[in-house]
């Protein structure tokens, strides 16, 4: 079965600064990927970022430099400390469209005790969803 | 068909606050950002701030912070934005237009809202 | 915050000739520029996004180029409905306008 790991990580240099990683574990190829805040698109989420294969990458502020890490994970910067930018209990989602298995979706958040700098290393999340 | 209705043109006296309206169809009106735009007479464009309808979420060009407040009606489909203490540096066409995502940015605009301040 | 110069002003042509108009960023938007043009009345019209990704229903005489800080648009083949005024939008992050550049028919 498919699944989505999501780790959030708080920048030591930069308290509000976070630093959010995504990434597919299946065996399909992806068309896109959508990563939102604030809960799962279409559940009260506001989109962060769309990242297609061949049509680009769109981001919205205060989601910074949006890109690729592999064929099957990206990664985005979150920066910013104004009425619009996230905070430590921030939840975080990200949306996988691939062929053959469908959208796969999962969430994450900061760790309750992390330290600046600090992640717990990428594991599936919890929230998993498949349409 | 992707369609933005705007409010028509309205004349307030100075001090007053007005409100414009922006009508969605044509499209899922929660999954994608509504901006505004503002142009000044014999003047270019200048973009205000934008709302995700989807979760409320908005962010405000630094030069608008207090002047315009933008919300939604999910129900109806519907953005407003409300303009405060308005002064005759307010009176200008006022566009929404909706950021298509990686169709582009601002790919549907409203026909625009004409707004005068004058006592 | 992102500055958007876009040049000429205005400029006049001949109908069936070419036209450029440039935007100059003050840093690297990457190629995240869109192109527009305006008619008073009508709300503005997308042209171009990324560069040069002409909109499905924009005809292949309106084309854009560049990358980094500096980008052009060019119309060839000029016919009466292009009269209008036209602006770059970079929205690399957050949006900034050009200065918009009004043509005429000569």
């Known amino acids: 079965t498919p699944e989505v790991w999501v780790q959030v990580r708080m920048e030591a240099t930069e308290l509000s600064s976070f630093t959010i990683r995504c990434g597919f574990l299946g065996s399909g190829s992806i068309s896109l990927v959508t990563v939102s805040w604030g809960g799962p698109n279409g559940a009260g989420g506001t989109t962060l970022a769309v990242l297609h294969p061949e049509r680009g990458i769109r981001q919205w502020a205060p989601a910074r430099q949006a890109r690729w890490e592999t064929q099957s994970s990206i990664s985005l910067i979150l920066e910013g400390s104004g009425a619009s930018s996230p905070c430590a209990n921030t939840t975080f989602c990200c949306k996988f469209a691939s062929f053959p298995e469908g959208s796969w979706e999962a969430c994450g958040s900061l760790p309750p005790s992390s330290d600046p700098g600090l992640s717990a290393p990428p594991t599936p999340a919890p929230i998993l969803r498949a349409d | 068909q992707v369609h933005l209705q705007q409010s028509g043109p309205d004349l307030v006296k100075p001090g007053v606050s007005v409100k414009i309206s922006c009508k969605a169809s044509g499209y899922t009106f929660t999954d994608y950002y509504i901006n505004w735009v503002k142009q000044r007479p014999g003047q270019g464009l200048e973009w205000i701030g934008w709302?995700?309808?989807?979760?409320?979420?908005?962010y405000y060009n630094e030069k608008f912070k207090g002047k315009a407040t933008l919300t939604v009606d999910k129900s109806s489909s519907t953005a407003y934005m409300l303009l405060s203490s308005l002064t005759s540096e307010d009176s200008a066409v006022y566009f929404c237009?909706?950021?298509?995502?990686?169709?582009?940015?601002?790919?549907?605009w409203g026909q625009g809202t004409t707004l005068t301040v004058s006592s | 915050d992102i500055q958007m110069t876009q040049s000429p002003s205005s400029l006049s042509a001949s109908l069936g000739g070419k036209v450029t108009i440039t935007c100059k960023a003050n840093?690297?938007?990457?190629?995240?520029i869109a192109w527009y043009q305006y008619k008073p009345g009508k709300g503005p019209r997308l042209l171009i996004h990324y560069t040069s990704t002409l909109q499905p229903d924009i005809p292949s005489r309106f084309s854009g180029s560049g990358s980094g800080r500096d980008f052009s648009f060019s119309i060839s083949n000029l016919e009466p409905e292009d009269i209008a005024t036209y602006y770059c939008l970079q929205y690399d992050y957050l949006y900034t306008f050009g200065g918009g550049t009004k043509l005429e028919i000569k």
């Open positions: 840093q690297d938007i990457n190629k995240y």
């Open positions: 237009a909706r950021d298509g995502g990686l169709r582009g940015p601002f790919d549907y």
């Open positions: 709302i995700f309808p989807g979760s409320g979420t908005t």
